[in-house]
């Protein structure tokens, strides 16, 4: 007789999980030589035990402590880049200003990147057909519980100037709701960051207004200003220039406004 | 490049106020908090605190509460530290630094000196 | 308050030498692997000038002949070699928690 499965609304995990997130650990440890002495099976191992067995409605921070311990990573805190709404981006430029990073750009966030996974209760398979919805079905569930995690973590590593890069063509430029709003933007340290420079990302060729005056910006610069943080907003009319002024700065061109 | 211009040498009676002014050039001046360091004749350097030139909030270290003011001009990127009922310790140089927590720009120093 | 505590209060050391440091914090000034120690020179009359930011930093246009080392409470400047115009004070600064703190300076003399 097949045992009943929780059905849950958001997609079950990725196809080969497992194998994925070690030959990601691999691939990565060997491209970065600081991260060399990563044993990966322990990763691994650390990452499934966050969530194996357990309801996948009640995965807390500590549950993925061991995967922390294990994925400890220094990055130069004054080079952090945060984003939201705008990944692709945001990779892009930190695949042209190496010295920058994305939280995708360290070990953790690698893995993870762009995957879906959970257990279920009490036994030790991997839930392929379906996983909680973080709206629908509970918000403490493996995925979302995991990049809040890595998020606060990254957040409260940051210090000196900190940018971040918002989606200018949405509705909310700045979402409360977003990871970097509710997440990342609470665990700035103020005695550690000096400034956050939203950069905000045009989408129309035509488009010439000062985003940096939308509401939700004001938003934003509210928050930061209560945490004594020092708060500073540019436009990025053209995205596609601002890349390419960012692998030749000394083309001609780039001297205007991008 | 970056500079920070302070204000000259002031003497002053016990008792008296002075005003100490710090501009900045080179860069945006509301990206950057402004710290003041005080440094009494043949002494080590204390950090007295910071102005945030985004919003104007002053942390002032508790050492330095009570006659110790940090203000703003943005509109000519100037800071400001204002001591009152100056007292014959208050004589020192006291130093503008920009943020972050570590201070790569100083101003030149201002030397204060109390006495009657 | 964090306190720091360099040592020596003063050294002379001949030129091509190395000048050792230390600053000892009473608590950790480390987050996340980054440490928030930093290292300055002093030359009398003059404003304080940054060497060393983060532990390891060089600052721009600093000659490679400052480096700064450790983390957690116990941290390093060395000058190697020293030149004769390395004669000032040197301090080091936490920034990891208000109130900033600074050592209380380390005279160098060139013999």
């Known amino acids: 007789v097949p045992r009943w499965r929780q059905q849950w609304s958001g997609p079950g995990t990725t196809k080969r999980f497992p194998e994925t997130v070690l030959a990601r650990c691999v691939k990565y440890t060997e491209i970065h030589p600081e991260m060399r002495h990563v044993d990966c099976q322990s990763v691994w191992d650390a990452f499934k035990g966050a969530f194996i067995s357990k309801h996948p409605c009640n995965i807390t921070e500590e549950d993925y402590q061991p995967l922390m311990k294990l994925g400890t990573q220094t990055v130069p805190c004054n080079k952090i880049l945060l984003w939201s709404r705008i990944k692709d981006l945001a990779h892009q430029f930190t695949q042209v200003q190496r010295d920058m990073f994305t939280l995708e750009d360290t070990l953790l966030g690698y893995l993870a990147d762009d995957l879906t996974w959970c257990g279920e209760f009490n036994t030790s398979k991997i839930n392929y057909q379906s996983c909680p919805d973080w709206r629908k079905d509970c918000s403490n569930n493996p995925v979302s519980v995991f990049w809040k995690t890595v998020s606060r973590r990254f957040a409260e590593a940051a210090c000196d100037v900190v940018h971040v890069m918002l989606n200018g063509s949405r509705s909310k430029i700045f979402d409360k709701n977003s990871t970097f709003g509710s997440v990342e933007v609470h665990n700035l340290q103020p005695e550690k960051v000096q400034t956050l420079e939203a950069w905000v990302i045009h989408g129309g060729r035509e488009d010439s207004r000062d985003l940096c005056q939308d509401p939700t910006i004001k938003e934003l610069e509210s928050i930061i200003s209560k945490r004594n943080i020092q708060f500073s907003c540019k436009n990025i009319y053209r995205p596609d220039k601002f890349l390419q002024c960012v692998k030749n700065p000394e083309d001609s061109s780039c001297t205007s406004e991008i | 490049q970056i500079q920070l211009v302070q204000s000259g040498s002031e003497l002053k009676k016990p008792g008296a106020s002075v005003k100490v002014s710090c501009k900045a050039s080179?860069?945006?001046?509301?990206?950057?908090?402004m710290n003041w360091v005080r440094q009494a004749p043949g002494q080590g350097l204390e950090w007295m605190g910071w102005?945030?030139?985004?919003?104007?909030?002053?942390t002032v270290a508790d050492d330095f509460k009570g006659r110790f003011v940090f203000s703003l001009d943005t509109s000519v990127s100037t800071a400001y530290l204002q001591i009152s009922s100056l007292k014959a310790e208050d004589t020192a140089v006291y130093y503008c630094?920009?943020?972050?927590?570590?201070?790569?720009?100083w101003g030149q120093g201002t030397l204060v000196t109390v006495s009657s | 308050d964090i306190v720091l505590t360099q040592s020596p209060a003063s050294l002379a050391v001949s030129p091509g030498q190395r000048a050792t440091i230390t600053c000892r914090a009473s608590?950790?000034?480390?987050?996340?692997?980054?440490?928030?120690m930093h290292w300055y020179q002093q030359k009398p009359g003059q404003p304080p000038k940054l060497l060393i930011y983060?532990?390891?930093n060089l600052e721009s246009g600093v000659p490679a002949r400052f480096s700064g080392s450790g983390s957690g409470t116990d941290f390093t400047l060395t000058i190697n070699p020293v030149e004769a115009n390395d004669t000032a004070n040197y301090y080091c600064?936490?920034?990891?928690?208000?109130?900033?703190?600074f050592g209380q300076g380390t005279k160098v003399e060139i013999k």
């Open positions: 630094a920009r943020n972050p927590g570590w201070f790569a720009y």
């Open positions: 983060r532990a390891s």
């Open positions: 608590e950790s000034v480390d987050n996340y692997g980054n440490s928030f």
């Open positions: 102005i945030n030139t985004y919003t104007g909030e002053p």
């Open positions: 080179g860069y945006t001046f509301t990206n950057y908090g």
């Open positions: 600064q936490q920034s990891h928690e208000a109130p900033w703190t």
